[in-house]
Interface confidence: low
Amino acid sequence: SPVPPSTALKELIEELVNITQNQKAPLCNGSMVWSINLTAGVYCAALESLINVSGCSAIEKTQRMLNGFCPHKVSAGQFSSLRVRDTKIEVAQFVKDLLVHLKKLFREGQFN
């Protein structure tokens, strides 16, 4: 059976914490990704941004987990209306921003 959304979000947060804490060299070799609007559709938007990073084992599990929250199929190069136009940030910063936002959602009980 699927895990409850609260558990899934908790697992995603734990994975992001793990990434930030275990970061030694620049995450994903300093790859840049599109910054996203965190106020709506965060899971699909985050996946649409991170899926463009390939060959980075550190975020593969995160990519798979985000995939579970997004109902539609996401492929590399897909444009998201939720991205912050023409603004790119390092994956490490993206993960930190996402982590802060998801922790807030979890505290507020917004698991969906």
Epitope: S1, P2, P5, G68, C70, K73, N112
Partner: antibody
């Protein structure tokens, strides 16, 4: 253990009504979307309707739109399907399904099915 | 309305590979799901998200999806795999099931 138990099926005349119920147990019912899927005798599967989890959205197949209404009572862990203006072609086994629809779920798809309840529409 | 087309039947010898196709317009842009249904039983999800197996589903079941076709492959088919198989996708706020394929294990 996750379980879905359908009830309410039976024999009804064309134009009549029935209300199907699905009692859920073993999971946090309110967190999940639920669907009804039917299967006519000797035929394939046909999705009928879905009710999203926290989102409160409802969805219907064109074949039942305007005649069937899906609802849920999270306090009773129960999903319902109100079927009005029934036709012979609505004769089928109706399955209650724990769903993976939409942005409200950790989306695995329809991985828990009830045993089904039989609806027969005949005069 | 969106349609998913499957071959009515597929026959396979024990131990061989059975492939079931599911065709739909730009199906590769959607997630494909596969269900197994044995006579008198409720359907069972065997593949979700094109190629992922739920826990408890044997490794011999695999899936792929690209272009207009999703494929369910059963490697080393066993007698217990004889069943009806249905593909499924989500399109325009409705679920769509395929027409179904009866897999017969010969012998």
């Amino acid at each position: 253990e996750v379980q879905l138990l359908e009830s309410g099926g039976g024999l009804v005349q064309p134009g009549g009504s029935l209300r199907l119920s699905c009692a859920a147990s073993g999971f946090t019912f309110s967190s999940y979307a639920m669907s009804w899927v039917r299967q006519a005798p000797g035929k394939g599967l046909e999705w009928v309707s879905a009710f999203s989890g926290s989102g409160g959205s409802t969805y219907y197949a064109d074949s039942v739109k305007g005649r069937f209404t899906i609802s849920r009572d999270n306090s009773k862990n129960t999903l319902y399907l109100q079927m009005n203006s029934l036709r012979a072609e609505d004769t089928a086994v109706y399955y209650c399904v724990q769903d993976g629809l939409g942005p409200y779920f950790y989306n695995y798809g329809m991985d828990v099915w009830g045993q089904g309840t039989t609806v027969t529409v005949s005069s | 309305s969106y349609e998913l087309t499957q071959p009515p039947s597929v026959s396979v010898s024990p131990g061989q590979t059975a492939s079931i196709t599911c065709s739909g317009d730009k199906l590769g842009d959607k997630y494909a799901y596969w269900f197994q249904q044995k006579p008198g039983q409720s359907p069972v999800l065997v593949i979700y998200h094109d190629s992922k197996r739920p826990s408890g589903i044997p490794e011999r079941f695999s899936g792929s999806n690209s272009g207009d076709t999703a494929t369910l492959t059963i490697s080393g088919t066993q007698a217990m795999d004889e069943a009806d198989y249905y593909c499924q996708a989500w399109d325009s706020s409705t679920y769509v099931f395929g027409t179904g394929t009866k897999v017969t294990v010969l012998g």
